[in-house]
Amino acid sequence: TNQGNSADAVTTTETATSGPTVAAADTTETNFPETASTTANTPSFPTATSPAPPIISTHSSSTIPTPAPPIISTHSSSTIPIPTAADSESTTNVNSLATSDIITASSPNDGLITMVPSETQSNNEMSPTTEDNQSSGPPTGTALLETSTLNSTGPSNPCQDDPCADNSLCVKLHNTSFCLCLEGYYYNSSTCKKGKVFPGKISVTVSETFDPEEKHSMAYQDLHSEITSLFKDVFGTSVYGQTVILTVSTSLSPRSEMRADDKFVNVTIVTILAETTSDNEKTVTEKINKAIRSSSSNFLNYDLTLRCDYYGCNQTADDCLNGLACDCKSDLQRPNPQSPFCVASSLKCPDACNAQHKQCLIKKSGGAPECACVPGYQEDANGNCQKCAFGYSGLDCKDKFQL
């Protein structure tokens, strides 16, 4: 629903777009470091024409928290990186720190990797809407495409045949799945490709029955699909890589006219565009909001999260395009040289995490960071990561795929 005298219709920059309702993925609670969003929560039409300074908005109350440095999140609820597109290339093991209470990918692993999800392949490559000046209409969110890869009727296990290549992790939705690459990469054509990261928050109206905790529900999958379709429309398939859903949280409606029976969620996302894109944080925000406002849909607003804040870094001239190169904020530190995220100093990764095919993760809520092999590898007696035996995959080679 994108019309209403509301509190969030106007972003800190200038922009717009549109789309329908809900869906997500159950994978692993890949709780990426959460960062403060530079959201401006103002009434739909601000009284001033100049953009207000970005502030954090929780939409649920009038309190405006000050941006907190990114921290590692271990809540197992709706913090699930859900990609919403597909396209990327990785190869290097960026050992970023991730946390998770449970992994709901294809096996009940304890840990979680800092990978970025991406659709295994999308059945429905949605062609970008033509913005033909004087011609057809704006991109409208009427077609709900399922950007899934593996299909089945019930909530089966679409990851059982290990469809994800290039050491990416298969993440299960309802009856589809996507492949999760390392942070900053997106999955495309069976490889993880490096892209440009654009973190943000999108507000979406959902059905009253939507439960952000039910990551295997059809509604969650639909949400994922909707967001993917929107972004694919906005950026086009040549530029769009994928969108990862990090968290889904319910809050009060940003529109002043909405009533209590309207359900509205804030979806924290990371959009990964092709490395060659000329888009920057400002143009990305503007394009998305322009699209949202062009027609009537479930999307309410998109707010930018500064990339440097997302990584926990001090601002740089290039807006922290390289998370590995930026300087951590004073109260944070990089858990290890290969982590793009700066975190609270107590969460330091062991030095051994720099080894090949290793990653840093928190296996238990509140636990200390540990080193583990990336999916597709397991530790041998010497502590080195070796490729899984034929027929096995996933974290610690616990996933047996059917031949």
Partner: antibody, heavy 114, light 106 residues
């Protein structure tokens, strides 16, 4: 508060052109699509098209292609609609509107008569 | 394009009476929006996103529906409700309006 102030009534000759204006205030003009709607006397509403002032992007109802041209001036927060080759069929009240938040101008009455 | 058919075209109701008017879309739309227009004035947004009342709209009004079938209801007609009501979709381009339902007071 938000206001959309339209230009005054016009009486023009058939075959000529006219440019109607809609001055916006109270919101970020360049970030919301401006729509134009036609209403003939005693008739219903008909969508003409929309313009995104931020970059000038436009979409038209096919029935109005070649008839209406939408433009916007960000510096003055004003949207314009030019109607060309006017006939008596173009006699109507024309509204500018921001559908997103439900704001409408007061309407401009256009009379085409010889 | 999506055609919106409103019915009835004209109706009258006595004060206190319940009023229902419908809007049928030729194909499915995400949301329907309703406008109230009185003679010589611009349309006012009345109900948006199918069921949300615009600012200042009395609680006796309601909207519902999904897909291709939508309706506007007044629980208890009042004199000031006499007007023409238009439904609109702007989910799909070109955006379209219904032909209107004229509501008169008996």
């Amino acid at each position: 508060q938000v206001q959309l102030q339209q230009s005054g009534a016009e009486l023009v000759r058939p075959g000529s052109s006219v440019k109607i204006s809609c001055k916006a205030s109270g919101y970020a003009f360049s970030t919301y699509w401006m729509n134009w709607v036609k209403q003939r006397p005693g008739q219903g509403l008909e969508w003409i098209g929309q313009i995104y002032p931020g970059d000038g992007d436009t979409y038209y109802n096919g029935n109005f292609k070649g008839k209406a041209t939408l433009t916007a001036d960000k510096s003055s927060s004003t949207a314009y609609m030019q109607l060309s080759s006017l006939t008596s069929e173009d006699s109507a009240v024309y509204f500018c509107a921001v559908f997103w938040d439900g704001y409408w101008g007061q309407g401009t009455t256009l009379t085409v008569s010889s | 394009q999506i055609v919106l058919t409103q019915s009835p075209t004209i109706m009258s109701a006595s004060p206190g009476e319940k009023v229902t008017m419908t809007c049928s879309a030729s194909s499915s739309v995400t949301y329907i929006h309703w406008y109230q227009q009185k003679s010589g004035t611009s349309p006012k947004r009345w109900i948006y996103d199918t069921s949300k009342l615009a600012s200042g709209v009395p609680a006796r009004f309601g909207g519902s529906g999904s897909g291709t079938s939508y309706s506007l209801t007044i629980n208890s007609m009042e004199t000031e409700d006499a007007a023409t009501y238009y439904c609109q979709q702007w989910s799909s381009n070109p955006f379209t309006f219904g032909s209107g339902t004229k509501l008169e007071i008996k």
